[in-house]
């Protein structure tokens, strides 16, 4: 609904549309009979100038030609790209109170004319999809602005759609709602982008193709796979297609992985059989289409098959390690530990452990099925066993693997030598030693087993442990190291039927203790005292302890405290003094020491030799 | 000449309400046209609501549309913003404007905007 201007008219000079840099006039003038009604000649027209319809400017300094109470002309420069307002405004100047009327509006909308449009590009999406071209319409005009697409093809074929660009929206595609079918495949076609606005127009360049540049099949659908006797590694692929069809180019890749297996496959009809796939892993599959198999463009992919293939039976071997603690005189206990299965060994969930112990010689055989990774059992001390291990999952079991029970670390002549623990960063440590001086037959392997140095661990833990080759003699264990934390770690240096180890501790990372041991008694024998502490609580040694102090000095004094320092041994838990004087009251305190330094003392206790009776 | 003098800002936290009202005085004619505006500390004053006299529709900006609800009552010449379900976003100063309803060569009639509040400040914290 337009709204008359019924006190005057409001023109522009040359136009309401300019282009940028130019100068307009804008002329006000009242109707007849209307303004101030009094007094004609007091008159005074005024123009005020609005941005986004907010007032920025009173261009009474612009005025360039005045007929006194009937119209003024203003002269109006430097207009921004865009739309601006302008206002002509009656003002009545001998009545102060009433503010000026306004008059009338009028639009100045600067601008530039259209640039030809660039890199049109058409397509048609499917056999049945009609023709759609978009293009570049260049720099932006600041004006509403008309585009025509025009086709042309053979047998006068002709056609053409308009879209327009204005401040709210763009035009910069059009469909052209026509289907170009195969049986124009060797036809070309023109079209041209037209643009037209009120200060100009152009062209594009005519941009040529044909049936097959610009058709893109839709993508397959439909797509399933078939396991060929429920195998693992090998399906077929199935998929629907648009007729014209004739080349295929299938993705699949495991669902954590980041790189494709790409397969090109020309007159498919719909089916591939893929005979690499990894058992029990979850794929992800997509199809994309092409109608020639030299020209055209490629389909997009289609929508993802996701579905995991079959289990098989597990390959590869387990694993196994053991510790054996003797009960009595007759009877040992064998623990077996094991690693799981990568899952490309496993092949599919295991299910079981098949576990058998065997005595060689009498062929005594234990066996049992276990779903977890370690299995305990009472064996007499005598004879050779060995033991085997196999994971099953629902096609079948792996190849089992054999162990030798041999006394792991009874042959002193086949210990490693020079072990040391160095620390590497925050979870790691680097275990490296020598091989066995006089060994009498031959290392097959090193296994490094550590384990955390902390109540009840033996029990509450299974070991962590690595297989090292028999010319290897350095290992980083890296498995649930964390830092501040001691772990005893052992190298055993195992031989056919026999087994010798080196024992070490070590730490990733280590800090002084957090407090001193506390010393529980101090008793008196044969001029010696005994000094018995409990150890450091385990959160609080944070790192491996090295080596306890006891510091004592008399009661009283200022002079700086003995000291007597004694190798960390976690059995040891009293050490003798003996360099104390009779009848002088001493205060006695302990500390810990770590490869990061002193802990704080401990409590002090107050002791009184009392030394040989008389 | 027009008067305007707004009330009502404050703090208020994330989802709150408040209402903020604007009085008017002087030419009516001048103010056919009633509206808020805000400006948020380094942003370009923005037109939120707007109502006139004309006998049409508020006008609401996207960003605040279904939330605020602007009201005029011309008897007592204030028009007052509701502001609902308010958001850290919505922190500026509020400024209430008028101005006149212009007739337009070969376009409808448009509200321009003269004279101005003196602004409210309205904080939203999340």
């Known amino acids: 609904n337009i709204d008359v201007c019924k006190l005057g008219t409001v023109t522009v000079q040359p136009a309401p549309v300019i282009p940028l840099g130019s100068a307009a006039n804008i002329s006000c003038s009242l109707n007849p009979k209307q303004g101030c009604s009094h007094y004609p000649s007091s008159n005074e027209l005024i123009l005020l100038k609005f941005v986004n319809d907010v007032l920025v400017e009173n261009l009474h300094g612009k005025k360039v030609h005045d007929h006194t109470g009937h119209s003024s002309t203003f002269q109006v420069t430097n207009l921004s790209l865009g739309m601006t307002l302008f206002v002509c405004k009656l003002n009545c100047s001998n009545s102060q109170k009433k503010p000026p009327v306004p008059v009338c509006g009028v639009e100045i909308s600067v601008g530039v004319a259209p640039e030809p449009p660039q890199n049109i590009s058409c397509v048609q999406e499917g056999e049945n999809g009609t023709v759609a071209c978009s293009w570049n319409s260049g720099k932006v005009t600041y004006l509403k602005t008309n585009y025509t697409l025009q086709l042309s093809g053979p047998n006068n074929l002709t056609c053409q759609k308009q879209c327009f660009s204005d401040n709210r929206q763009n035009c910069n595609r059009l469909d052209l709602g026509i289907n170009l079918s195969p049986d124009l495949a060797e036809s070309r076609f023109i079209v041209r982008v037209t643009a037209i606005n009120d200060l100009g127009n152009s062209s594009s360049l005519p941009h040529t193709f044909t049936f097959l540049d610009i058709v893109i099949p839709l993508p397959p659908w439909d797509i399933r796979i078939n396991f060929l006797n429920a195998s693992g590694s090998r399906g077929t692929l199935q998929w629907e297609d648009e007729g014209q069809v004739v080349l295929n180019q299938l993705r699949y890749q495991p669902l954590n992985s980041t790189s494709w297996n790409m397969v090109n496959a020309t007159n498919a009809k719909g089916k591939y059989d893929l005979r690499d796939l990894r058992p029990f892993t979850e794929y992800e599959f997509q199809i994309s289409s092409k109608l020639h198999l030299s020209g055209g463009s490629w389909s997009n992919w289609s929508e993802s098959l996701r579905t995991r293939t079959p289990e098989e039976e597990p390959v590869g071997i387990l694993d196994i390690w053991y510790m054996k603690q003797d009960i009595d005189y007759d009877r040992q206990q064998i623990s077996l530990f094991w690693k799981s299965l990568n899952p490309s060994e496993a092949r599919g969930k295991i299910l079981h452990y098949q576990v058998t112990l065997q005595e060689v010689t009498k062929k005594t055989t234990l066996q049992n099925t276990t779903r977890h990774t370690s299995w305990t059992r009472v064996i007499p001390r005598t004879g050779a066993w060995t033991a085997s291990v196999s994971a099953a999952n629902s096609k079948g079991a792996s190849a089992p693997t054999h162990i030798n029970i041999v006394d792991l670390c009874g042959t002193g002549l086949l210990a490693p030598h020079q072990v040391s623990a160095k620390s590497e960063n925050m979870d790691n440590i680097l275990v490296t030693w020598q091989p066995p001086k006089k060994a009498d037959s031959a290392v097959r392997e090193y296994i490094v087993e550590w384990r955390a140095l902390q109540p009840g661990s033996i029990t509450k833990f299974p070991p962590h442990w690595l297989r090292i080759p028999p010319d290897n003699m350095s290992a980083l264990i890296s498995e649930n190291i964390k830092p501040y934390i001691c772990y005893e770690i052992r190298v055993h240096a195992l031989s056919e039927s026999q087994g010798g180890c080196s024992s070490i501790r070590g730490d990733s990372k280590h800090k002084a203790p957090v407090s001193g041991p506390h010393i529980t008694a101090i008793t008196e024998k044969k001029e010696r005292l005994f000094i018995s502490w409990t150890h450091i609580p385990f959160p609080e040694q944070r790192g491996c302890i090295l080596h306890y102090r006891i510091y004592w000095k008399e009661r009283d004094s200022t002079a700086q405290p003995e000291l007597c320092e004694i190798q960390y041994r976690r059995s040891q838990n009293s050490h003798p003094i003996s360099s104390l004087q009779p009848r002088v009251t001493y205060v006695l305190w302990m500390t810990a020491v770590t490869a990061a330094g002193e802990s704080p003392q401990g409590n002090e206790r107050e002791f009184c030799p009392q030394g040989k009776a008389n | 000449q027009v008067q305007l003098q707004e009330s009502g800002g404050g703090s208020v936290q994330d989802g709150g309400s408040l209402r903020l009202s604007c009085a008017a005085s002087g030419d009516i004619y001048a103010r056919n046209c009633m509206g808020w505006f805000r400006q948020a500390p380094g942003k370009e004053r923005e037109k939120i609501a707007v109502a006139d006299t004309g006998g049409r529709s508020p006008y609401y900006a996207d960003s605040v549309k279904g939330r605020f609800t602007i009201s005029r009552d011309n008897a007592k010449n204030t028009v007052d913003l509701q502001m609902n379900s308010l958001k850290p976003e919505d922190t500026a100063v509020y400024y209430c404007?008028?101005?006149?309803?212009?007739?337009?060569?070969?376009?409808?009639?448009?509200?321009?905007?003269?004279?101005w509040g003196q602004g409210t400040q309205v904080t939203v914290s999340s």
């Open positions: 404007a008028a101005g006149p309803l212009v007739p337009v060569v070969n376009t409808a009639a448009r509200c321009v905007y003269e004279y």
